[in-house]
């Protein structure tokens, strides 16, 4: 093999170790991770790199090709036997593309000084890397004092002549970062001070958090911050057909990783999440709210033929209350209650029934009692009026029984027991009720109120009256009690089936007090108020009939 001395005497000739190195090393070069954006990658530049070596006999470019015959830009320097080396290699201007912190990855080999004969005094095993910021693409400057040192680069692995013999090359990779940058771009410079180096590749990149869709929010490509510990808060935007309660945010770390998600987007009503997008609910399905995860089938007795439905339409004769959730089945009014029975106790009626066969699909069934008073002769019914009391109540009954009190005695009633539920008032259909006809028991009649005097003579008084307002049954007879005024303890009773009587054997020119009461099968009513009439004197004519006030 060619002597390494050839490297020094013929600096323009590529020594064997470089050729061996490249063939081995370039096969190991990997594609950049997705969170790294290359600003420069010497491996991928097809033409001239445009780098400058100063002095001219320092760094030299070795023109090699890889197995695909693509050019490989490799720079080497190996002036280890000469003192006071100060060889600079300047890159072309590199745009930082808005990044404030950049990374430089160097791949290089370095010769072990111990393996070089005679060069121990002058041989170095490090080189220096510098940068110079500039907005000017043509502002390359060779004044050393304008360059800022990034670091001294040393090799983790150096190689010896033995390695060369075995064709084993030890490729070093070193990464340094620079920041914060404040200008549009920069130059890099590599300073050799007497080492034997082959600079195989230079990759300059910045890190970004790559665009991502998370929780239905799109987060854009985000360049990492200048500070290695900085977390950048980034706002996401909701994907199509999605909304948010809490704006989505994530934090972009200096390493280009998304961290600490806050908030999220949700597919809006009528849409559901599928494969990171919001897809429309198809006909037959709906989604009422963004907070529901997926479209659901329309509940029973409802349908939708629309896409993106937020609710379903009730079938004919089915209804939904405003307070019913859209996930609830549409319902209908209940059927009529069944098997109604009554129990009459004088002027009270107890009704009992069993619930309707069809509740309409609802749990909120209650009952309403309609009361009608019917004339048995005319067959005409009218509302019962306010005097009837319902125990516990007339409407909103939850139990299947009710008691009506204060009914009229001996009266025909029709009670309609109606089943209702939460949608009964939405239905135009007929009321669903069961009817019960009852007749209340007879009771003692109410007092006679209307008494008229008839013919009055010196020894007799004729009276007539009307049936009580509330006979409470069939009037069997009337009882007429009368006595001479102030002689109450000495009274006479007359019974009559008619509404007229004549009291005889009375004293002339005397005042008599009359009270009348009626009797039904249930007994006597109370006596009427007192009516006073006076017989005529011995010589007077009998009086005409007139109503007593």
């Amino acid at each position: 093999p060619a002597s390494l001395a050839g490297c020094y005497s013929a600096p323009r000739r590529a020594p064997l170790w470089t050729c061996l190195l490249l063939c081995a090393a370039l096969r190991t070069l990997l594609a950049s991770p997705s969170n790294e954006v290359n600003l420069l990658d010497s491996r991928t530049v097809m033409g001239d790199l445009g780098w400058i070596a100063f002095p001219k006999n320092g760094w030299e470019e070795i023109g090699e090709v890889d197995e695909n015959y693509a050019p490989i830009h490799t720079y080497q320097v190996c002036k280890v036997m000469e003192q006071n080396q100060n060889n600079w290699l300047l890159t072309s201007w590199i745009s930082n593309e808005g990044a404030s912190r950049i990374f430089i990855e160097l791949k290089f080999t370095l010769r072990d000084c111990n393996s070089l004969p005679g060069g121990l005094g002058t041989c170095k095993e490090t080189f220096n890397m510098y940068y110079f910021e500039s907005d000017d693409q043509n502002g390359r400057n060779i004044k050393e004092n304008q360059y800022i040192k990034i670091d001294t680069i040393a090799a983790d692995e150096s190689f010896t002549e033995l390695d060369l013999g075995d064709r084993v090359m030890k490729l070093n990779t070193e990464v340094r970062d620079v920041g914060p940058l404040s200008k549009k771009g920069f130059y890099l410079a590599f300073q050799d001070v007497g080492a034997c180096i082959a600079l195989v590749s230079v990759r300059v990149y910045y890190k970004k958090c790559p665009s991502v869709v998370r929780h239905l929010a799109v987060f854009p490509d985000t360049i990492t911050g200048a500070d290695s510990s900085q977390l950048l808060e980034v706002s996401g935007s909701c994907v199509n057909h999605s909304v948010t309660d809490e704006p989505p945010k994530m934090h972009c770390s200096a390493e280009g990783e998304w961290l600490v998600p806050i908030g999220k987007c949700m597919c809006k009503a009528g849409y559901e999440e599928k494969n990171g997008t919001c897809q429309v609910c198809r006909p037959g399905f709906f989604k009422a709210s963004p907070h529901i995860q997926s479209c659901g089938k329309c509940p029973p007795h409802s349908y939708t033929h629309e896409e993106a439905s937020t609710s379903c339409v009730c079938e004919k004769d089915y209804f939904r209350r405003e307070s019913d959730p859209p996930t609830m089945a549409c319902t209908r009014p209940p059927s009529a209650p069944r098997n109604a029975i009554s129990n009459v106790n004088e002027t009270s009626v107890f009704l009992e029934w069993i619930p309707p066969a069809d509740t309409g699909g609802r749990k909120d069934v209650s009952y309403y009692i309609a009361c009608k008073k019917c004339n048995s002769h005319a067959g005409v019914c009218e509302e019962c009026g306010g005097h009837v009391r319902y125990l516990p109540r007339q409407s909103g009954l939850k139990n299947t029984s009710v008691m009506m009190v204060d009914l009229l005695a001996h009266t025909n009633y029709t009670f309609e027991i109606e089943a209702v539920n939460g949608v009964s008032d939405l239905s135009p259909g007929a009321r669903q009720y069961v009817s019960v006809n009852v007749t209340t028991n007879q009771a003692a009649p109410s007092p006679v109120t209307n008494v008229k005097k008839g013919k009055i003579a010196k020894n007799s008084i004729s009276l007539s009256w009307q049936e009580p307002d509330r006979p409470n049954g069939i009037i069997l007879e009337y009882e007429i009690k009368y006595f001479e005024k102030d002689q109450e303890t000495s009274y006479t009773i007359i019974k009559s089936k008619e509404t007229t009587i004549t009291a005889e054997g009375l004293k002339p020119a005397s005042v008599y007090v009359f009270q009348i009461r009626a009797r039904t099968a249930a007994g006597y009513g109370v006596f009427s108020r007192r009516f006073e009439f006076e017989t005529t004197p011995v010589f007077a004519a009998s009086s005409d009939q007139s109503q007593i006030p």
Epitope: R282, P283, G284, F285, K297, C298, Y303, H305, E306, E307, A308, V313, E315, K316
Partner: antibody, heavy 120, light 111 residues
Framework: EVQLVESGGGLVQPGGSLKLSCAAS????????IHWVRQAPGKGLEWVAS????????YYADSVKGRFTISRDNSKNTLYLQMNSLRAEDTAVYYC?????????????WGQGTLVTVSS | DIVMTQSPDSLAVSLGERATINCKSS??????????MNWYQQKPGKAPKLLIY???NLESGIPDRFSGSGSGTDFTLTISRLEPEDAASYYC?????????FGQGTKLEIK
Amino acid sequence: EVQLVESGGGLVQPGGSLKLSCAASGFTFSTFGIHWVRQAPGKGLEWVASISGASTTIYYADSVKGRFTISRDNSKNTLYLQMNSLRAEDTAVYYCARYGTSFPYGLDYWGQGTLVTVSS
Amino acid sequence: DIVMTQSPDSLAVSLGERATINCKSSQSVDYDGDSYMNWYQQKPGKAPKLLIYGASNLESGIPDRFSGSGSGTDFTLTISRLEPEDAASYYCQQSNEDPFTFGQGTKLEIK
């Protein structure tokens, strides 16, 4: 009672136009999707087009896309099919049919059909 | 488009016997656990009538001698005891995906 009655069919020359109507009654028209289906003489059924109740979703068979337009007027309870650039192969009985309410929906009520003849 | 293929194209069955019509779709017509497959009966000069929806649900008013089965791509319409009025053409239709394609039809005759 649900009823669908088609009208507007007749004889038309190739390249001509015709507008079919479908009058609906007996149901809440505006909440139902309606479809047009045709049947060439002696042949099977061919789905033509559909429209949702609110006209938000409209679909056409490839064979009529760009030539036929389905529309509806919910205030008149009427569905339409505007047929332009008619061809001989469009000759058929055209039925309108209602999308059903029992899931998954079929076409539960059909009109009696109206005959369209495309011939020179 | 989903292609629907019925078999046989025609069949003749004796009164009281069982008739079976098959329908195969070029891709699955299932979605979310339901089969979007419908069967229609059509008599000459009349509009089609829905018999079965969702592969196996009997439409209201249809005699229970009609039944449907199947899922995915393979479906069957069965008439358990043939009556004279069952002589007609029968069509399958998928409603899973637009266009809502029909099968070519099967003509059922009474032997």
